[in-house]
């Protein structure tokens, strides 16, 4: 039985050209996390495997950095980065947990965001 829940940063916004941390946290389960995938729509951004470490997709290597922790840092944001992001936790024995984050990249400097996940 899957008892875990994923907490995410929810809906966040950031300024064009800036950076943002996408963060998920799996709680309420003793299941072992074997891998976390970060995806944007159907596109793979990054993988963090407990044994094999991080893999950043080549097309995002210049703008995506691993961490902190199992999170993902997006840099040099553009308006095209606006959209849904998913953290997919592969666990044993529970199975797969998925969290959703919506990122809006704003042109102006009036971006409102959750400060604890924003990089100046």
């Amino acid at each position: 039985m899957m008892t875990g829940t994923i907490e995410t940063t929810g809906n966040i916004s950031a300024e064009k050209g800036g950076s943002i941390i996408l963060q998920c946290h799996l709680s309420s389960t003793t299941a072992q996390v074997t891998q976390v995938n970060w995806e944007q729509q159907d596109q793979l951004l990054a993988i963090c495997n407990a044994d094999l470490g991080w893999h950043i997709s080549p097309s995002f290597k210049d703008r995506v950095a691993p961490g902190p922790g199992l999170g993902l840092t997006l840099q040099s944001l553009t308006v095209n980065d606006t959209g849904e992001y998913f953290c997919i936790y592969h666990t044993y024995p529970d199975g797969t947990y998925t969290g959703r984050i919506f990122l809006e990249v704003l042109e102006s400097s009036v971006a409102e965001h959750g400060a604890r996940f924003q990089i100046p």
Partner: antibody
Amino acid sequence: EVQLLESGGGLVQPGGSLRLSCAASGFTVSSNWMSWVRQAPGKGLEWVSTTSSSSWNNYTYYADSVKGRFTISRDNSKNTLYLQMNSLRAEDTAVYYCAKGSYGMDVWGQGTTVTVSS
Amino acid sequence: QSVLTQPPSASGTPGQRVTISCSGSNSNIGAKYLYWYQQLPGTAPKLLIYLNDQRPSGVPDRFSGSKSGTSASLAISGLQSEDEADYYCAFWDDHLKGWVFGGGTKLTVL
């Protein structure tokens, strides 16, 4: 250029020992996942051992068939990977390859031949 | 006996499209990423496909990988004589903590 060069293979009697070396150039072994894979004559590929990046968790992993007999290690100052093989058996006869990479082994050496026979 | 099953042999004529299969179970192929290696006669293996369908730089786009359910496949289009080789599928087993290789498929270009 990124390269791996194995050495240390040879003929050894059952129960004997051998140490294989894999000299790396063009990258640092300490910051990469490194593996040993073997291929018995006329057979397929068989994974032997992997050591993870020292900056990740520095773990070592072994196939059940070699656990307790083989030891993977590296010398960062020499940028070299090793495989210490003890209590060798006839079924360990194979070409041994070292390889670099975590999400797929993207660089391989040319292999070194180990023959275990009396 | 590997948990990944590949046909021992496959063949095709130059210019043809050939497919090599790799089948397993839900606990390996179904839940993991697949990798493909090419081993030309007398040489070391070479990474051909990683993460199911990604090609390392330098690998021609004639080679493509796919995965569906508990089966994966490697497709080679525009077959060339230099594609004659052994092909292996593999995955990292999170529970065994090690790489698992399929038995290999010998591709012959007729």
